[in-house]
Amino acid sequence: KETAFVEVVLFESSPSGDYTTYTTGLTGRFSRAGATLSAEGEIVQMHPLGLCNNNDEEDLYEYGWVGVVKLEQPELDPKPCLTVLGKAKRAVQRGATAVIFDVSENPEAIDQLNQGSEDPLKRPVVYVKGADAIKLMNIVNKQKVARARIQHRPPRQPTEYFDM
């Protein structure tokens, strides 16, 4: 279970037409349900129930987005339409280049994602929790255009101070 380094850029447009950016990072884990590779795309929040819809025509996005799914407490959805792995597959079928699950409310999902599959997805399936999950949901709740870049090694930072 390797660390996934997620870099997020929020785009803030101004009335004059130009924009500023806000860049941040968070860490998650690559699950065995998907591939440990880099991916990049615009963040699209998906409701877990929204992934139940079988009509793929209805909900197709352009290929190359990063799906963000906040999993609910299992008690709130005792008979889910799809397993967590099934939800990841459905998102990838709809064009997600990667899926990030917030597992804070449903930590059992970690085991489900890491059980190992005969046929793992060819795209990364990442899970986040704690402060990283709060940050991710705060990004989504800003309702701004945001792009995520998922990497399996940390991006080099110019802000580290080395005490010689």
């Epitope: 860049t23 941040t24 990072g25 990283d132 940050k135 800003k142 580290e160």
Partner: antibody, heavy 118, light 107 residues
Framework: EIQLQESGPGLVKPSQSLSLTCSVT?????????WSWIRKFPGNKMEWMGD???????NYNPSLQIRISITRDTSKNQFFLQLNSVTTEDSATYYC???????????WGQGTLVTVSS | DIQMTQSPSSLPASLGERVTISCRAS??????LNWYQQKPDGTIKPLLY???NLQSGVPSRFSGSGSGTDYSLTITSLDPEDFAIYYC?????????FGGGTKLELK
């Protein structure tokens, strides 16, 4: 209880650089949160200066972009503010805080007064 | 940048009184508004986040409300420790900005 403590010189000469350190205890600066510098001018005006994320990304207030730098030393659990070419207008109480654009400022240092004067 | 205007800038009040502080933004905030209290000794603590959510340890006499560009902080029954400066702060749009502060003082 998470604590933040600012330190640095209380007096800086105009045109010089202001350098402050924020030492964090009972939380690690790589724990997922963002860490900010905020200043309060005489007369109560408050200004967010910039932040550094748990992953080391920095964001600055556009009004200070060309003069400011925020760095960190994860081994000492500290982050730093450097403000260049200061003028008397930069005299303020400087606070470090946990939080930023993506988190409310939940923990604050006690503040350190910096006066810019020759 | 979003401009935050607080009113009044000074508010004389008595113990046990109910007071309301207002905060108006130059753009819609979608509830991305926080409140802070600065004590006379300079220490700052968070009170509410996302308009109406109490930070842990904050007494229930504090409450927040609002939408769009207009928000308010209400203290239902003033305690001696409530006399301080209150700031609103938006994080709807980058960079985060603060209101000018409201000084709550003993009448």
């Amino acid at each position: 209880e998470i604590q933040l403590q600012e330190s640095g010189p209380g007096l800086v000469k105009p045109s010089q650089s202001l350098s402050l350190t924020c030492s964090v205890t009972d939380d690690t600066i790589t724990s997922g949160y963002d860490w900010s510098w905020i200043r309060k001018f005489p007369g109560n005006k408050m200004e967010w200066m910039g932040d550094i994320s748990s992953s080391g990304h920095t964001n600055y207030n556009p009004s200070l972009q060309i003069r400011i730098s925020i760095t960190r030393d994860t081994s000492k659990n500290q982050f730093f503010l450097q403000l260049n070419s200061v003028t008397t207008e930069d005299s303020a109480t400087y606070y470090c805080a946990r939080g930023g654009f993506l988190f409310p400022f939940t923990f604050w240092g006690q503040g350190t007064l910096v006066t810019v004067s020759s | 940048d979003i401009q935050m205007t607080q009113s009044p800038s000074s508010l004389p009040a008595s113990l046990g009184e109910r007071v309301t502080i207002s905060c108006r933004a130059s753009q819609v905030l979608n509830n991305n508004l926080n409140w802070y209290q600065q004590k006379p000794d300079g220490t700052i603590k968070p009170l509410l986040y996302y308009t109406s959510n109490l930070q842990s340890g904050v007494p229930s006499r504090f409450s927040g409300s609002g939408s769009g560009t207009d928000y308010s902080l209400t203290i239902t029954s003033l305690d001696p420790e409530d006399f301080a400066i209150y700031y609103c702060q938006q994080d709807a749009s980058f960079p985060p900005t603060f209101g000018g502060g409201t000084k709550l003082e003993l009448k």
